[in-house]
């Protein structure tokens, strides 16, 4: 018995906007019916929650008011859309998925997108 | 699925030691980094030590005072501790993270990465 797998991409590009969104996939030993993913960020030694969500299988992903993250679900695929970054927030992001329901519990971890976030030039002045 | 249950608190007179064991079953610790976490009374849940195939790594705390190992064929992780203060009164916890290529001896022990949460055992260093 082995840790549950989770797929995520390398390496992701933020937009000009500062949005970064990637696809957290998971090989579920079992039928679950609630799930939760988070988010982790991993730079400079240090790890932060950047955002989790429970959810029931077959409903959306929920996340707080206040939370940078959004995102969908289908299936054991998760689509997870990160905004607001900035060049300060490039960082490997870690997808964890644990199956908290029914039992027995299980827990996968991805192994990090890196998350590349360059913030856009400011517009020059122009004189028209 | 991993299964983990510790054993071994109690109460114990400063300067004293206790030796905690989280033992495995349903799997083999082999892919697992261990970890030993803590919380106190009041406050949040800290990491004590972690342990995965080749490395281990301590909070600053308990340095030179605690010792992390395992036994692959028990299937189970020890926490020997020696020279027991009252500030290390709490309730202890094992839980398991799946190895990564990403962690350092510095993120190994991060509990964010973690799952499979025992229980918890009450050790209590008190004259």
């Known amino acids: 018995c082995k840790a549950m797998h989770v797929a995520q991409p390398a390496v992701v590009l933020a937009s000009s906007r500062g949005i970064a969104s990637f696809v957290c996939e998971y090989a579920s030993p079992g039928k679950a019916t609630e799930v939760r993913v988070t988010v982790l960020r991993q730079a400079d030694s240090q790890v932060t929650e950047v955002c989790a969500a429970t959810y029931m299988m077959g409903n959306e992903l929920t996340f707080l008011d206040d939370s940078i993250c959004t995102g969908t679900s289908s299936g054991n695929q998760v689509n997870l859309t990160i905004q607001g970054l900035r060049a300060m927030d490039t960082g490997l992001y870690i997808c964890k998925v644990e199956l908290m329901y029914p039992p027995p519990y299980y827990l996968g971890i991805g192994n990090g997108t890196q998350i590349y976030v360059i913030d856009p030039e400011p517009c020059p002045d122009s004189d028209f | 699925e991993v299964q983990l249950v510790e054993s071994g608190g109690g109460l114990v007179q400063p300067g004293g030691s206790l030796r905690l064991s989280c033992a495995a079953s349903?799997?083999?610790?082999?892919?697992?980094?261990i970890g030993w976490f803590r919380q106190a009374p009041g406050k949040g849940r800290e990491t004590v030590s972690c342990i995965n195939r080749s490395r281990t790594s301590y909070a600053d705390s308990v340095k030179g005072r605690f010792t992390i190992s395992r036994d692959n064929s028990k299937n189970t992780v020890y926490l020997q501790m020696n020279s027991l203060r009252a500030e290390d009164t709490a309730v202890y916890y094992c839980?398991?993270?799946?190895?990564?290529?990403?962690?350092?001896?510095?993120?190994?022990?991060?509990?964010?990465?973690?799952?499979?949460w025992t229980q918890g055992t009450q050790v209590t260093v008190s004259s």
């Open positions: 839980a398991a993270s799946p190895d990564k290529p990403f962690y350092t001896d510095q993120t190994m022990c991060n509990k964010h990465y973690y799952g499979y």
């Open positions: 349903g799997s083999t610790l082999d892919p697992f980094v």
